[in-house]
């Protein structure tokens, strides 16, 4: 209750693809970073396919202003939902509600959230209450992921190639993160 | 519920580098935002960096540039910090905390236990 | 690199109420600090009391509330128990640097 979407649009997107954008232009302030060593999971390929370009699922583009109690975002946030079934992107309808979605014969297919950000928000509160400040988690990208017979969240597997945490440097692509946080809020929300 | 365990005590000598790990259970630890934290014997608390999940960089503050590097290994959900070139002054307990992956970032919310490094001739 | 500052030491009787102030050398502190105040008791680790100025957690005992006051983040205890005898610690971010205060070492006696 409380969250107000004025805003929902949608786009087609192909995960783990192409150029990650610029980081934003770094704040005035006393932050110093350093790369870090490389680490972490090498690339992999949890099942053969000849192009993982062909394959694709949806963002929902969502704008719109965030609750903490009575307290109420000055401005709206802009988030993703990450929507439907994972399939080959000439199968996939350009808009919602048009064709069917492609399932595959064998392992089930999900599309998750891939990266996570933070965005700071003024929450407004009524009464004359002071203005309260938060760092919400919002979705900034979604992927597809081979969901196991058991269909547990823990056990999704990577579709396509994923790099390794990015070894944060002065480029560095956005984090990835997993499925478990936020999604009882996203599912509760819509 | 989010759990850190931390590697275990270390003695180390002027010069010589040290590599404490920390072991996420309960998230991934791509869900979570992780901070280094340590503790000189009778003194405070020192932020040494971490990951801010704003500008999807990891920060290291000031004092330690060039000399610590955080790094995170996601095939084990554990994370990293080396600090190199030790010397008597950085004897102290580091910590690795984190966020509760919850809907608001709330950092610095679970703890590790601590890992106890000496640095001694 | 900013400096924050607390009380090097308070002293507060059972049953009373004190309150520790957070303090940074650039100027007022404000919600865009996120002002943290955590507390620790010897041989713990810290444990996180208050975030983003005056949010609990489900750990954080009713007595203990956050707030901003004249400038500085402030951590009110009212009903102040032996238990809470510690190291308190407060936290601002710098725009994704964080900074921890000294340290008040709170005495309830």
């Known amino acids: 209750q409380g969250w107000q979407a004025f805003k929902n649009d949608a786009t087609e997107i192909i995960p783990e693809l192409g150029e990650y954008p610029e980081p934003p232009p770094e704040l005035e302030n006393n932050k110093t970073m350093n790369r870090a060593e490389n680490g972490g999971r090498p690339p992999h390929h949890p099942f053969e396919t000849k192009d993982v370009s062909e394959y694709s699922c949806r963002e929902l583009h969502f704008t719109r202003y965030v609750t903490d109690g009575q307290c109420r975002s000055a401005k709206p946030v802009t988030e993703l939902v990450c929507s439907g079934q994972c399939g080959p992107a000439r199968l996939l309808p350009n808009a919602i509600g048009r064709g069917k979605w492609w399932r595959p014969s064998g392992p089930d297919f999900r599309c998750i959230p891939d990266r996570y950000r933070a965005q700071r928000v003024q929450l407004l509160c009524p009464g004359g209450a002071a203005p309260r400040a938060r760092k919400v988690r919002l979705v900034a990208s979604c992927k597809c992921k081979r969901l196991t017979r058991f269909h547990n969240q823990s056990e999704l597997k990577d579709f396509g190639p994923e790099a390794a945490r990015p070894q944060k440097g002065r480029k560095p692509r956005p984090r990835a993160r997993g499925a478990k946080a936020n999604q009882a809020e996203l599912e509760n929300a819509y | 519920e989010v759990q850190l365990v931390q590697s275990g005590a270390e003695v180390k000598k002027p010069g010589a580098s040290v590599k404490v790990s920390c072991k996420v259970s309960g998230y991934t630890l791509t869900e979570l935002s992780m901070h280094w934290v340590r503790q000189a014997p009778g003194k405070g608390l020192e932020w040494m960096g971490g990951f801010d999940p704003e500008d999807g960089e990891t920060i290291y503050a000031q004092k330690f540039q060039g000399r610590v590097t955080m790094t995170e290994d996601t095939s084990t959900d554990t994370a990293y910090m080396e600090l190199s070139s030790l010397r008597s002054e950085d004897t102290a307990v580091y910590y690795c905390?984190?966020?509760?992956?919850?809907?608001?970032?709330?950092?610095?919310?679970?703890w590790g236990q601590g890992t106890l490094v000496t640095v001694s001739s | 690199q900013a400096v924050v500052t607390q009380e090097p030491s308070l002293t507060v009787s059972p049953g009373g109420t004190v309150t520790l102030t957070c303090g940074s050398s650039t100027g007022a502190v404000t919600i865009d600090h996120y002002p943290y105040w955590f507390q620790q008791k010897p041989g713990q680790a810290p444990r996180t009391l208050i975030s983003?100025?005056?949010d609990k957690h489900s750990w954080t005992p009713a007595r203990f509330s956050g707030s901003l006051l004249g400038g500085k983040a402030a951590l009110t205890l009212s009903g102040a128990q032996p238990e809470d005898e510690a190291e308190y610690y407060c936290l601002l971010d710098y725009g994704g640097t964080f900074v921890f205060g000294g340290g008040t070492k709170l005495t309830v006696l």
């Open positions: 905390a984190t966020d509760s992956a919850g809907y608001w970032y709330k950092f610095f919310q679970h």
């Open positions: 983003d100025t005056d």
